[in-house]
Interface confidence: low
């Protein structure tokens, strides 16, 4: 029995719901007192949901999966995560058997927007060209970990005294801080830019400093 | 400054295949995602493959088991490799900075015909 | 058929007001940042608005962008014969797994 799930991950923002995809081709005269149709966590195989005898057996997995019961009689047996948690990610394997059997595995990427940057500087008044001043780029409850990059106001990366730390909180959302250490020119923007892998999602926040005063765009 | 130089295209057969090229310069290569779009003469806008700074590869529906991008810091170059051309895949391709393509080449052109 | 929907063509007389609307879903336009491009006859395209709302240097600040649920908009204040052009929206797909751009709006300057 072929059992097909997509290829590439699916990917799913924290608290929205997740499908994930698999289907199988019923054979003519096929009924569902005939399916038994497991879903479980790949690695420890932890039950996830399952349908048997006719009967959905319901969630083993927090009360927060379904199945699609109208569509499993044409193949269908894709399972419908609820409020995707970043504990939720990871791979899935679809168990269908009728008379023979087959399972494929569909992973599950988490995924959670990071919030605009909020900037700021250190020390605050009083620059000259020649300071050396410390820049602070904050943006937090993001996943996966962030890719940070700054950039001067030609867009010129700056790679060099920038110190980033990632940290996640009790949900698994990462709060990510950049420090960069820069000697100030005669005026100057920095920008930091905040970038999820895996939404492809770039967050950015900036501060031009003119000697006086700083503006924070 | 920033610039972006792609050569390799031409005329080419449908079942052929043709390598694209995009020479970067003025700006840390290695540190940038980049992309191939593409436009069919007298159409839109089309985005045919992306690969992040750390070479994972993204591809549109159309070219994806056809096409390759590539990509070789050490000669700041990016690469198409096109393979199984059809007709549809006549356009102008351009390489750019970012999948959001800040940064454009001038294009070059693949034809594919018999 | 683009997943963007854009209306082919737009049109306004120098000095006035244009919107470009674009349509999406909550898959891209909804979760995701949009882009907008200025394609002039004849050249490549070129960026005129980054991460929704942003300009590159360069750029009038006669250009805007916004979005709002799954739609996003460019707006030209203080139209001029120059901007007579493509213009394309575009963001990333979460479902597509791959970025997107939209059909196109010829804008004509009357």
């Known amino acids: 029995l072929e059992v097909q799930v997509p290829e590439d991950p699916v990917v799913a923002l924290v608290g929205t719901d997740a499908t994930l995809c698999c289907s199988f081709s019923p054979e003519p005269g096929f009924s569902l007192a005939q399916l038994n149709l497991i879903w479980q966590l790949t690695d420890t195989k932890q039950l996830v949901h399952s349908f048997a005898e006719g009967q959905d057996q319901g969630s083993a997995y927090a009360n927060r999966t379904a199945l699609f019961p109208d569509l499993l009689a044409q193949g269908n047996a894709s399972l419908r995560l609820q409020r995707v948690r970043v504990a939720d990610e990871g791979s899935f394997t679809c168990f269908v058997s009728i008379r023979d059997f087959g399972s494929a595995a569909v992973s599950l990427q988490v995924a959670a927007p990071y919030s605009k940057p909020s900037m700021t500087l250190e020390p605050n008044k009083d620059l000259r060209p020649g300071d050396t001043v410390t820049i602070t780029c904050s943006s937090y409850r993001g996943y996966p970990e962030a890719e940070v990059f700054w950039q001067d106001g030609q867009g010129v990366p700056l790679t060099g005294n920038v110190t980033t730390s990632q940290m996640a909180n009790e949900q698994g959302l990462f709060d990510v801080h950049s420090v960069l250490r820069v000697v100030l020119g005669a005026n100057g923007t920095y920008s930091c830019l905040v970038r999820n892998p895996v939404l492809q999602q770039d967050a950015h926040g900036s501060v031009t400093i003119t000697g006086q005063p700083m503006t924070f765009p | 400054e920033v610039q972006l130089l792609e050569s390799g295209g031409g005329l080419v057969q449908p079942g052929g295949s043709l390598r694209l090229s995009c020479a970067a310069s003025g700006f840390s290569f290695s540190n940038y995602d980049m992309s191939w779009v593409r436009q069919a003469p007298g159409k839109g806008l089309e985005w045919v493959a992306g690969i992040r700074s750390g070479s994972r590869t993204y591809y549109a529906d159309s070219v994806k088991g056809r096409f390759t991008i590539s990509r070789d810091n050490s000669k700041n170059t990016l690469y198409l490799q096109m393979n199984s051309l059809r007709a549809e895949d006549t356009a102008t391709y351009y390489c750019g900075r970012y999948f959001n393509m800040d940064v454009w080449g001038q294009g070059t052109t693949v034809t594919v015909s018999s | 058929q683009s997943v963007l929907t854009q209306p082919p063509s737009a049109s306004g007389t120098p000095g006035q007001r244009v919107t470009i609307s674009c349509s999406g879903s909550t898959f891209n336009i909804g979760t995701n940042l949009v882009h907008w491009y200025q394609q002039l006859p004849g050249t490549a395209p070129k960026l005129l608005i980054y991460?929704?709302?942003r300009r590159p240097s360069g750029v009038p600040d006669r250009f805007s962008g916004s979005k709002s649920g799954t739609s996003a908009s460019l707006a030209i204040s203080g139209l001029q014969s120059e901007d007579e052009a493509n213009y394309y929206c575009?963001?990333?797909?979460?479902?597509?797994?791959?970025?997107?751009f939209g059909g196109g709006t010829k804008l004509t300057v009357l």
């Open positions: 991460l929704t709302d």
């Open positions: 575009a963001t990333w797909d979460d479902s597509l797994n791959s970025f997107l």
